[in-house]
Interface confidence: low
Amino acid sequence: QSPTPSPTGLTTAKMPSVPLSSDPLPTHTTAFSPASTFERENDFSETTTSLSPDNTSTQVSPDSLDNASAFNTTGVSSVQTPHLPTHADSQTPSAGTDTQTFSGSAANAKLNPTPGSNAISDVPGERSTASTFPTDPVSPLTTTLSLAHHSSAALPARTSNTTITANTSDAYLNASETTTLSPSGSAVISTTTIATTPSKPTCDEKYANITVDYLYNKETKLFTAKLNVNENVECGNNTCTNNEVHNLTECKNASVSISHNSCTAPDKTLILDVPPGVEKFQLHDCTQVEKADTTICLKWKNIETFTCDTQNITYRFQCGNMIFDNKEIKLENLEPEHEYKCDSEILYNNHKFTNASKIIKTDFGSPGEPQIIFCRSEAAHQGVITWNPPQRSFHNFTLCYIKETEKDCLNLDKNLIKYDLQNLKPYTKYVLSLHAYIIAKVQRNGSAAMCHFTTKSAPPSQVWNMTVSMTSDNSMHVKCRPPRDRNGPHERYHLEVEAGNTLVRNESHKNCDFRVKDLQYSTDYTFKAYFHNGDYPGEPFILHHSTSYNSK
């Protein structure tokens, strides 16, 4: 089943998938527990940058950029994407403990979610389902096979034998060759016609490009090295049986002298650079919780120390049809609440020695924006807002209302579609914002919908600090301070002057400053001052004052 394509070229493999590379995984290791949907840890990765399919340059940590003594010169490029960096670009040896710094880029592309099952092995070293890496170009099988320099390509298991015929032109053999690929993936070469048989090659030359697979035993914590050769070779000191070297300790070099009756001295001295133990690596989710709805970050962690040169370790990830040669990857612009599958493997000196598969479900995304149907003022102290909820999952609403610089917010039940606002201030503009939120790994707020209304008018409050003072025998000066709450559109001060029950003056000013002249001498007056806002009068402030007996 082919991977599901996506608009931007990044896909997620449907199950079952195929091996990450052609290197066969260890099959005589202990069983693993099945994978469950990967639970994220609250861990942060600080050094991730954006991974784009167009980014052709992979940054390499130069610190292995260092002791060159163990460097493997084989360049490896991706079969699917020719511009992806080679292994040689992303790995170099080191005399120290330098490791590869992640400075790749993040896949900034749409990744199709994984359908169906979670039954994927979650433990490095083996998996029940495979991934979609192309044939591993570490040891590519080409159509022209050279016997003298043959390096067997281990291919995925097949149910029937595959025969490849290659005409071989070689310094040592000139023959038409039939190469049979057995289900185990080893190449069996049978010579059909030998044109010439010159002198034998040296074993040193014949096995110059010999490749090795390392198989790890979790019980003994030892490795077995499987020599990828087509005949049963002999090893000095009888160190191998059936082309396998057993009981190799992690991170220790072992020297094996290889010979065969088809070649002459000098023998090939093979240095086995044994990888670190499989259980010393853990695939860790490094996604920042704030971004867990649309991003996935995966990172291999060294959970135990080992003495292997970390510069010789390379990491490979496949998420969909995108392949990354980094210790850490970051995928961006993903769909919230979707499952994505990533396969990963670790290589030591370009030999795969462990792998893991993760299914990660992205977090709940931010809810959408609610749709406000209407919001208006019903009365001087009340308003109402009604809305339709957003489509996406959410837990509750937050309604905020702002008057001038004051802001009040309240949480509303997710089932509400209407809210009556009480105790509002009359004749005041209220700006309302309504957003849904969801409590996921962090609280995610949706976009806010906005609306506004102005409450109806109401009677203003009383003027205050009213004073009445005599300016002459028959004149008074009345002053007051504005009301605390005007509660309406206009501003007018009124003064009513009564003598007994008779209204003798009624004045209206823009300011509360009245000069009342020509009053009767020696008379008791009642002064009533109030504010009118254009719709309603306020409560009057009342003072009593008497004119004096004329002094003249």
Epitope: Q59, D63, D66, N67, A88, T97, Q100, T101, F102, S103
Partner: antibody
Framework: QVNLLQSGAALVKPGASVKLSCKAS????????IHWVKQSHGKTLEWIGY????????NYNEKFRRKATLTVDKSTNTAYMDISRLTSEDSATYYC???????????WGQGASVTVSS | DVVMTQTPVSLSVSLGGQVSISCRSS???????????LNWYLQKPGQSPQLLIY???NRLSGVPDRFSGSGSGTDFTLKISRVEHDDLGVYYC?????????FGSGTKLEIK
């Protein structure tokens, strides 16, 4: 005493190429990377790239990827840097330096001055 | 690229005095092995640069203990105590954790 001996000063015309050499002695040449560094007159140091003498593997500063080519001759323990399409901007002193995994650039050549002038 | 900014551009010190040179990076460059490959070099007049301190605070064999390096994250310092005449020249910091390797613009140390 580790020694990196560089070729002498060079006066070259614009558009031409120059090949600088760096001969290593008193250590195992293939055990250390060779890095190349540019120092324009009175200016700071700029890293050009490195080569693994054992494998021939190279890595370059993007700025110099089309300008410099690094090679080695293991038989003579010599590293080379070819600078092509020379302009006045390439006038500088170029240093070779060796590097291990733990200790970076612990030995430097004496520098090779390149002057580009018509 | 990791940009390295050195301050001051130059400084003058009396013999026997003490100086500090600051180096600030545009981003953290801790290598994934946990090491910070921040190095200090001295280029004496008319000579090639020479390594003084590697991995922030490790003195190269033969470098006097008057030279000390410190710092973490994006801020690093080279301290020279009991300055001698032989210490004059241009001091460079450089990071070797990320490609491309980058250097500071240099601090010229002069003797009063």
């Amino acid at each position: 005493q580790v020694n990196l001996l560089q070729s002498g000063a060079a006066l070259v015309k614009p558009g031409a190429s120059v090949k600088l050499s760096c001969k290593a002695s008193s250590y195992t040449f293939t055990d250390y990377y060779i890095h190349w560094v540019k120092q324009s007159h009175g200016k700071t140091l700029e890293w050009i790239g490195y080569i693994n003498p054992k494998s021939g593997f190279t890595n370059y500063n993007e700025k110099f990827r089309r300008k410099a080519t690094l090679t080695v001759d293991k038989s003579t323990n010599t590293a080379y840097m070819d600078i092509s399409r020379l302009t006045s901007e390439d006038s500088a002193t170029y240093y070779c330096t060796r590097r291990t995994g733990v200790i970076p650039m612990d030995a430097w050549g004496q520098g090779a001055s390149v002057t580009v002038s018509s | 690229d990791v940009v390295m900014t050195q301050t001051p551009v130059s400084l003058s010190v009396s013999l026997g005095g003490q100086v500090s040179i600051s180096c600030r990076s545009s981003q953290s460059f801790v290598s994934s092995d946990g090491n910070t490959y921040l190095n200090w070099y001295l280029q004496k007049p008319g000579q090639s640069p020479q390594l003084l301190i590697y991995k922030v605070s490790n003195r190269l064999s033969g470098v006097p203990d008057r030279f000390s390096g410190s710092g973490s994250g994006t801020d690093f310092t080279l301290k020279i105590s009991r300055v001698e005449h032989d210490d004059l020249g241009v001091y460079y910091c450089g990071q070797a954790s990320k490609i491309p390797l980058t250097f500071g613009s240099g601090t010229k140390l002069e003797i009063k």
